[in-house]
C-alpha cells in the first residue's frame, strides 16, 4: 500500500484536476479522411487536467514520484493525467476490396488516472 | 497504424525528450523509513522530458492527442512521458513479527513512452 | 435529438420493386453511414447492408448483393433502400439506423412494412 | 459469416427475479457485441455496447459482460417493463449478424 493515499477529491477546485473530457474532432482534423468512411465526426475523451499531490494516483510509481517532485522540482516532474482504460470504436474503412469494419481498442479514454 | 507513425528521434536534442533517468531517494524522501527496514537508499528510474509531436507515441490516443495538441493547445494537452513498463523491486519490511520481503512490481520504471 | 423518420407502409406484387426512405434529422447527415436491417413477421434481425452519406461507399449482405441498392440525397438528409425482384419471403418491417463509433447504435427509424403477396 | 447464437429461446421469470441471457459467437468477435431489446410493434432499443458499457439511459440493472464467443445479458431484478425479445448483434466483421433472440416472458 506504500503508506501514501491517493485522494479523490481535487484541492484546485471543480474541473481543474485530471478527468475525462470529450473533444469533438473530424475525420480531416486526424488526418484520416482519405481512409476512414464513417464516422466522419468523432468524440473523443480524452484526460485533462492536473494531477496535485496524491490525486488519483495510477500505481505506487506514481506516489512516489508525487512525493518527489515536492522534494526536487526542478528533476522530478509531477504526475500527468493520461488513460487508464479505453473504449473501444469500430470504424468503416475504405479498403481495396471495398468497405471493412476496423476496431480500434486504444483510440478513446475511458477513465484517467495520474501517472 | 492508424496512419500517423511514432518517432524515436527526439527533434528538442540530446536528453530533451522523454526517457528514463534515475533518481535517488532515501527512505526519509520517500517517507518509509519507519517501516522498510533496507535498502535504506533506493535508486528510482522515472520517466522524464517532453513529448514533441509523435515522439514514442504510446498508442493510437496519444498519436490523436498529439495531433490535436497541434490544432487546439489550449483545448487539448500534449502526451506526457509516463512509464511503459516497471522493474520488480524488493524491499525489507519490518512487520509485528519481525522481518518480511515485499516485492514492488510498480515502483521503478523500466521503460517510457509519450502517453 | 437524433431523429430518423421512414416512409409509409408497401404493398408490392412478386417480382416488383421497393423504395424505402429514411429522413435524417438532429445530426450532421454526412457524417455518418446508414444501416438497414429487416425483420420478417414474428422473426429476428436481418441486416442487409450500411452507406455513408459522406460518399456513397457501400456494403451489402451478400444474399441481398443484385437486388439491393441503397443511395442517399444530401440535399435532402435522405437515405433510400430499393429492393427488387420482390419476392414473399422479402416481407418484413424495414429499419433505418444510423452508425456510431461504438458499433452498436440507439437510432434507429420507426419501421417501414413492406408486403409482397399477389 | 459469423452464426451469432442465444439461449434460451424462451425465459419464464417472475418480475424481481434476475434473468440470465446467453449469447454464443461461431468464432471470436472480441467484445463488439450489443444487446437490444425490442417490444411489439417498436423498434429495437440499444442496452449494451462493447460487450459491457450500458447505453445511455439504460438502468443499472441491465449489465453485460463477455468477451471472444461467450457473452451474457443480466437484468438483475426483472421490471414489468423488462418482458420483451432480446437480440444481441456482433459487429466484428461484416456481414452484422444478429442471434435469433430470446424472448422473456412473465412466469
Known amino acids: 500500500s506504500a503508506h501514501l493515499h491517493p485522494r479523490d477529491s481535487c484541492p484546485l477546485g471543480p474541473g481543474r484536476c485530471c478527468h475525462l473530457e470529450t473533444v469533438q474532432a473530424t475525420l480531416e482534423d486526424l488526418g484520416w479522411s482519405d481512409w476512414v468512411l464513417s464516422p466522419r465526426q468523432l468524440q473523443l475523451s480524452m484526460c485533462v487536467g492536473e494531477c496535485p499531490h496524491l490525486y488519483r494516483s495510477a500505481n505506487t510509481h506514481a506516489l512516489i514520484k508525487a512525493r518527489l517532485h515536492g522534494l526536487q522540482p526542478d528533476r522530478v516532474p509531477a504526475p500527468c493525467c493520461v488513460p487508464s482504460s479505453y473504449t473501444p470504436v469500430v470504424l468503416m474503412h475504405r479498403t481495396d476490396s471495398g468497405v471493412s469494419l476496423q476496431t480500434y481498442d486504444d483510440l478513446v479514454a475511458q477513465g484517467c488516472h495520474c501517472a | 497504424s492508424a496512419h500517423l507513425h511514432p518517432r524515436d528521434s527526439c527533434p528538442l536534442g540530446p536528453g530533451r525528450c522523454c526517457h528514463l533517468e534515475t533518481v535517488q531517494a532515501t527512505l526519509e524522501d520517500l517517507g518509509w523509513s519507519d517501516w522498510v527496514l533496507s535498502p535504506r537508499q533506493l535508486q528510482l528510474s522515472m520517466c522524464v522530458g517532453e513529448c514533441p509531436h509523435l515522439y514514442r507515441s504510446a498508442n493510437t490516443h496519444a498519436l490523436i492527442k498529439a495531433r490535436l495538441h497541434g490544432l487546439q493547445p489550449d483545448r487539448v494537452p500534449a502526451p506526457c512521458c509516463v512509464p511503459s513498463s516497471y522493474t520488480p523491486v524488493v524491499l525489507m519490511h519490518r512487520t509485528d513479527s519481525g522481518v518480511s520481503l515485499q516485492t514492488y512490481d510498480d515502483l521503478v520504471a523500466q521503460g517510457c513512452h509519450c502517453a | 435529438q437524433v431523429q430518423l423518420v421512414q416512409s409509409g407502409a408497401e404493398v408490392k406484387k412478386p417480382g416488383a420493386s421497393v423504395k424505402v426512405s429514411c429522413k435524417a434529422s438532429?445530426?450532421?447527415?454526412?457524417?455518418?453511414?446508414i444501416f438497414w436491417v429487416r425483420q420478417a413477421p414474428g422473426q429476428g434481425l436481418e441486416w442487409m447492408g450500411w452507406?455513408?452519406?459522406?460518399?456513397?461507399?457501400?456494403h451489402y449482405a451478400q444474399k441481398l448483393q443484385g437486388r439491393v441498392t441503397m443511395t442517399t440525397d444530401t440535399s435532402t438528409s435522405t437515405a433510400y433502400m430499393e429492393l427488387r425482384s420482390l419476392r414473399s419471403d422479402d416481407t418484413a418491417v424495414y429499419y433505418c439506423?444510423?452508425?456510431?463509433?461504438?458499433?452498436?447504435?440507439?437510432?434507429w427509424g420507426q419501421g417501414t412494412l413492406v408486403t409482397v403477396s399477389s | 459469416e459469423i452464426v451469432m447464437t442465444q439461449s434460451p429461446a424462451t425465459l419464464s421469470v417472475s418480475p424481481g427475479e434476475r434473468a440470465t441471457l446467453s449469447c454464443r459467437a461461431s468464432?471470436?468477435?472480441?467484445?463488439?457485441l450489443a444487446w437490444y431489446q425490442q417490444k411489439p410493434g417498436q423498434a429495437p432499443r440499444l442496452l449494451i455496447y462493447?460487450?459491457?458499457t450500458r447505453a445511455t439511459g439504460i438502468p443499472a440493472r441491465f449489465s453485460g459482460s463477455g468477451s471472444g464467443t461467450e457473452f451474457t445479458l443480466t437484468i438483475s431484478s426483472l421490471q414489468s417493463e423488462d418482458f420483451a425479445v432480446y437480440y444481441c448483434?456482433?459487429?466484428?466483421?461484416?456481414?452484422?449478424?444478429f442471434g435469433g433472440g430470446t424472448k422473456v416472458e412473465i412466469k
Open positions: 438532429g445530426y450532421t447527415f454526412t457524417d455518418y453511414g
Open positions: 448483434q456482433q459487429y466484428n466483421n461484416w456481414p452484422i449478424t
Open positions: 462493447g460487450a459491457s
Open positions: 439506423v444510423r452508425d456510431t463509433q461504438y458499433g452498436g447504435s440507439p437510432y
Open positions: 452507406i455513408t452519406a459522406y460518399s456513397g461507399d457501400t
Open positions: 468464432q471470436s468477435v472480441s467484445s463488439n
